[in-house]
């Protein structure tokens, strides 16, 4: 009778992560008597996957009933496959011996490759806010996928971006891979409602890409424009001066009124109105008692927005002349609080 051969018919098997891998193995003879063991790898570092004779292998089930005397099918199923299971599996026949069984024949091996889905892309923006016209970087990361081939695209409000750089690691073969991409985005004043999207396509996703998003509202700072206006006289000795703070984002804003350089009142923006583009407007007013002043009064509206250096706008209130509506429609310059724009 011809000597027993161990046949592993599949040179390679490709399985999706989470699924069950079937590793086929048959023997050509019932003789010699002895168990089958499955190993990953060979040599001194090989890993025992299944032992027909003894042991507990919760992820492994046999395809046929190995207790039947005439059984020659030693195929196994390994459940809940992960990328870490990739490798070459050997079906090894042992000959019954005393005290120990002796290795008798090995199959040629089956390469198990694992297809694993990428994790949901995580998009992160810069640590600090930036103002319009500045270029900011966004990163996108996804992990744990296999095989290595993957496609990543960037979008801003549905428009595909072209200025980005992508790396897949590691460079060589691995059980699973990670992708890291950095995109550059130029901010505009209209970007409060904008979104940046990172889209990842992989063979395991069956044409339904994964997306990660970042809202530019968390990245952008739109500095305010200031306008100080003197309103008509309410009473003979009172003047109402307003400071219009327009088109700012985010809402965090503190306004200080100064009369001739001395702090008159400080308040925090609360009841703001929202513009269509997501920016905010706010107005503060100051009632000035003209009779309390002998000389002309210099009123300054000083605004500190989102922790940035203060910007200010000044208005000269003529005490000698009869107060009439006056002011400026010129936008305030972004000057430090120690410099004043006098109109």
């Amino acid at each position: 009778e011809e000597e027993l051969q161990v046949i592993q018919p599949d040179k390679s098997v490709l399985v999706a992560a989470g699924e069950t891998a079937t590793l086929r193995c048959t023997a050509t003879s019932l003789i010699p008597v002895g168990p089958i063991q499955w190993f990953r790898g060979a040599g001194p570092g090989r890993e025992l996957i299944y032992n027909q004779k003894e042991g507990h292998f919760p992820r492994v089930t046999t395809v046929s009933d190995l207790t039947k005397r005439n059984n020659m099918d030693f195929s196994i199923r390994i459940g809940n496959i992960t990328p870490a299971d990739a490798g070459t599996y050997y079906c090894v026949k042992f000959r019954k011996g005393s005290p120990d069984d002796v290795e008798f024949k090995s199959g040629a091996g089956t390469e198990l490759s694992v297809r694993a889905k990428p994790s949901a892309p995580v998009v992160s923006g810069p640590a600090a806010r930036a103002t319009p016209q500045h270029t900011v970087s966004f990163t996108c990361e996804s992990h744990g996928f296999s095989p290595r081939d993957i496609t990543l695209k960037w979008f801003k409000n549905g428009n595909e971006l072209s200025d980005f750089q992508t790396n897949v690691d590691p460079v060589g073969e691995s059980v699973s891979y990670s992708i890291h991409s950095t995109a550059k985005v130029v901010l505009t004043r209209e970007d409060v409602h904008s979104q940046v999207i990172c889209e990842v396509a992989h063979v395991t996703l069956q044409g339904d890409p994964l997306r990660g998003t970042a809202n530019l509202s968390e990245t952008i700072r739109v500095p305010p424009t200031l306008e100080v206006t003197q309103q008509p006289v309410r009473a003979e000795n009172q003047v109402n001066v307003t400071c219009q703070v327009r088109k700012f984002y985010p809402q965090r804003l503190q306004l200080t009124w100064l009369e001739n350089g001395n702090v008159s009142r400080t308040e925090t923006a609360s009841t703001v109105t929202e513009n269509k583009d997501g920016t905010y407007n706010w107005m503060s007013w100051l009632l000035v008692n003209v009779s309390a002043h002998r000389d002309d009064v210099k009123l300054t509206c000083q605004v500190e927005h989102d922790g940035q250096p203060a910007v200010s706008k000044s208005h000269d209130l003529k005490v000698s002349a009869h107060p009439k509506e006056q002011g400026s429609n010129t936008a305030a310059e972004n000057t430090g609080s120690n410099e004043r724009n006098i109109y």
Epitope: A42, G43, P44, E47, A86, G87, K105, P170
Partner: antibody
Framework: QIQLVQSGPELKKPGETVKISCKAS????????MSWVKQAPGKGLKWMVW????????TYADDFQGRFAFSLETSASTSYLQINNLRNEDTATYFC????????????????WGQGTLVTVSA | DIVMTQSQKFMSTTIGDRVIITCKAS??????VAWYQQKPGQSPKLLIY???NRFTGVPDRFTGSGSGTDFTLTISNMQSEDLADYFC?????????FGSGTKLEIK
């Protein structure tokens, strides 16, 4: 097809250093481990080291610890063997040989071999 | 270290002969044995692994057998291109060791 191409022959003096290379092609370098094997003229084969090309970690035979350094340049799919402070008994052909396993955790038999690099040490 | 002994340093053969090359391990190595063929000026070529598995592309006149400590490589129908050195190797335990080789010559 799978190829391991080694650098050319070297003639060195005792005490010098030699560095030879083995460039792999036809497969993904870091999927399979790499060994180095020594063969002195007219003699048998002696296994020196196995390198896990994915992690870069080597496993040495006792006789080849110390003066022998093994390294990888994965981006160039190349393995290197450096011998310091050369001795006459280092005169041999050095072969690189590839593992059979896909993600093997250890070496076993040597499925593919480089053509060999003859290192001659002579005063 | 495990010593792999190839007792025949040289073997004289005739074309068409059945040639049996033996290798004995100093301790049990299971079936963790490979056989290589090496021709002058060339690198070794893998013939057999796991004691009896023929490597891809190896002619079926080459057969490996044995387990435990005693192993054989059989060439069933000796050809002129088979004139070479033959080495066994164990990979059961570090360090991996080779036999000293058996050289086939024509009578």
């Amino acid at each position: 097809q799978i190829q391991l191409v080694q650098s050319g022959p070297e003639l060195k003096k005792p005490g010098e250093t030699v560095k030879i290379s083995c460039k792999a092609s036809g497969y993904t370098f870091t999927t399979y481990g790499m060994s180095w094997v020594k063969q002195a003229p007219g003699k048998g084969l002696k296994w020196m080291v196995w390198i896990n090309t994915y992690s870069g970690v080597p496993t040495y035979a006792d006789d080849f610890q110390g003066r022998f350094a093994f390294s990888l340049e994965t981006s160039a799919s190349t393995s290197y063997l450096q011998i310091n402070n050369l001795r006459n008994e280092d005169t041999a052909t050095y072969f690189c040989a590839r593992d059979p396993h896909y993600y093997g955790t250890s070496p076993a038999w040597f499925a593919y071999w480089g053509q060999g690099t003859l290192v001659t040490v002579s005063a | 270290d495990i010593v792999m002994t190839q007792s025949q340093k040289f073997m004289s053969t005739t074309i068409g002969d059945r040639v049996i090359i033996t290798c004995k391990a100093s301790q049990i190595v299971g079936i963790a044995v490979a056989w290589y063929q090496q021709k002058p000026g060339q690198s070794p070529k893998l013939l057999i692994y796991s004691a009896s598995n023929r490597f891809t592309g190896v002619p079926d006149r080459f057969t490996g057998s044995g387990s435990g400590t005693d192993f054989t490589l059989t060439i069933s129908n000796m050809q002129s291109e088979d004139l070479a050195d033959y080495f066994c190797q164990q990979y059961s335990t570090y360090p991996f060791t080779f036999g000293s080789g058996t050289k086939l010559e024509i009578k």
